[in-house]
Interface confidence: medium
């Protein structure tokens, strides 16, 4: 699986999850988030050669088409597969609020 | 929606579905498919600016991060959203077989 366990331990050029730290205030302008100050959102990148973690029959077809037509712009793309939520703390006036934001952290990638 | 109705009628530079005809024999080497000879598989391509058909909170976050850090390699990617099956005819010996291959035709795209 193209997950953090594999990708963070290997120098993988092809589609894999990569570490990316995002500071809420500096990188997003989300000044309301009190904690955490930032988090590892991660991202997916890298080429998708034929059959690499193909998501659908279409991505398999496109990967094969691309090997035979390497100059073509049509090729599968490395995108998130499994995502996890992130719990944030913010304040409404002086009242602390805890909220879970869904699909915030990429745990694995696929070729789609 | 970034679907064939919209994308095939407009000169859209950003993420959209694009027409792509694939000949089973010439482009994939699939000699076993008798009918059709080929089909419009289509594909997704184009930049994913902030909030363009964002698939998840993560793709929204990544798009926003990318507006402030345009040089960063971390950005959402234009990939298939809705796919449709394709019915094919092939032979096992002299016996014709009809099969529906799932997720073969891209009908719309998203930024993921």
């Amino acid at each position: 699986a193209l997950d953090t366990n594999y990708c963070f331990r290997n120098l993988e050029e092809n589609c894999c999850v990569r570490p990316l730290y995002i500071d809420f205030r500096q990188d997003l302008g989300w000044k309301w988030v009190h904690e955490p100050k930032g988090y590892y959102a991660n991202f997916c990148s890298g080429p998708c050669p034929y059959l690499r973690s193909a998501d659908t029959t279409h991505s398999t077809v496109l990967g094969l088409y691309n090997t035979l037509n390497p100059e073509a712009s049509a090729s599968p793309c490395c995108v998130p597969q499994d995502l996890e939520p992130l719990t944030i703390l913010y304040y409404v006036g002086r009242t602390p609020k805890v909220e879970q934001l869904s699909n915030m952290v990429v745990k694995s990638c696929k070729c789609s | 929606a970034l679907d064939t109705n919209y994308c095939f009628r407009n000169l859209e530079e950003n993420c959209c579905v694009r027409p792509l005809y694939i000949d089973f024999r010439q482009d994939l080497g699939w000699k076993w498919v008798h009918e059709p000879k080929g089909y419009y598989a289509n594909f997704c391509s184009g930049p994913c600016p902030y909030l363009r058909s964002a698939d998840t909170t993560h793709s929204t976050v990544l798009g926003l991060y990318n507006t402030l850090n345009p040089e960063a390699s971390a950005s959402p990617c234009c990939v298939p959203q809705d796919l449709e099956p394709l019915t094919i005819l092939y032979y096992v010996g002299r016996t014709p077989k009809v099969e529906q291959l799932s997720n073969m035709v891209v009908k719309s795209c998203k930024c993921s």
């Epitope: 990188d27 989300w30 309301w32 409404v92 006036g93 | 902030y50 926003l64 507006t67």
Partner: antibody
Framework: QSLEESGGRLVTPGTPLTLTCTAS????????MSWVRQAPGKGLEWIGI??????STWYASWAKGRFTMSKTSTTVDLKITSPTTEDMATYFC?????????????????WGQGTLVTVSS | AYDMTQTPASVEVAVGGTVTIKCQAS??????LAWYQQTPGQRPKLLIY???DLASGVPSRFKGSGSGTEYTLTISGVECADAATYYC????????????FGGGTEVVVK
């Protein structure tokens, strides 16, 4: 504590113009500072913000490339890079309600009186 | 992104009456909302922050409420001095936005 804008005047289209917001009674390094404009008879239009401490800036999507914000210890500048007639408005600077990181999350409690920019050939 | 839609554009109210102004965000702003009052030729004045907290020196007849994407400013016991234009502003984020302010509501006091 007060804010005063200056630099507004009549300019010809395409002539760069810099507006200055001067703060009194507090340190700009501790507060988020924004520029907001208002065309005659129209609503409030946010241009951007410069954060206290880090000095990092955010601009409205329509304002990127058209405006540049910078600051010193006592002033915040807004440069209109190439004014058009669409930029004719009163320009206000505004301070976040609270000091420290994210202090503008509770709105802008201190505003200048505004400075008028007229663009005409 | 985080577009603010304010309604109505204009409202007429009698002295002593109650007026309600609504503000809708295109996505959740987690109570990150401020309200301002502006009279002609004057600078805006902060009335309410964090959706419901009254700014310093603001009379208690001004009340803010709401959460998520829907917010309301209510002025009860309206006085002549309340004739002004009122604006909402999302304060959740500065990133990737067009304008954090709503279009404004003109309150006319009869």
């Amino acid at each position: 504590q007060s804010l005063e804008e200056s630099g507004g005047r009549l300019v010809t289209p395409g002539t760069p113009l810099t507006l200055t917001c001067t703060a009194s009674g507090f340190s700009l390094s501790s507060y988020d500072m924004s520029w907001v404009r208002q065309a005659p008879g129209k609503g409030l239009e946010w241009i951007g913000i410069i954060y206290g401490g880090s000095g990092s800036t955010w601009y409205a999507s329509w304002a990127k490339g058209r405006f540049t914000m910078s600051k010193t210890s006592t002033t915040v500048d807004l440069k209109i890079t190439s004014p058009t007639t669409e930029d004719m408005a009163t320009y206000f600077c505004a301070r976040g309600r609270d000091g420290g990181a994210g202090g503008s999350r509770n709105g802008y409690s201190l505003w200048g009186q505004g400075t008028l920019v007229t663009v005409s050939s | 992104a985080y577009d603010m839609t304010q309604t109505p554009a204009s409202v007429e109210v009698a002295v002593g009456g109650t007026v309600t102004i609504k503000c809708q965000a295109s996505e959740s702003i987690y109570s990150g909302l401020a309200w301002y009052q502006q009279t002609p030729g004057q600078r805006p004045k902060l009335l309410i922050y964090a959706a419901s907290d009254l700014a310093s020196g603001v009379p208690s007849r001004f009340k803010g409420s709401g959460s998520g994407t829907e917010y309301t400013l209510t002025i009860s016991g309206v006085e002549c001095a309340d004739a002004a234009t009122y604006y909402c502003q999302q304060t959740w984020t500065d990133g990737g936005i067009d304008n954090p302010f709503g279009g404004g509501t003109e309150v006319v006091v009869k």
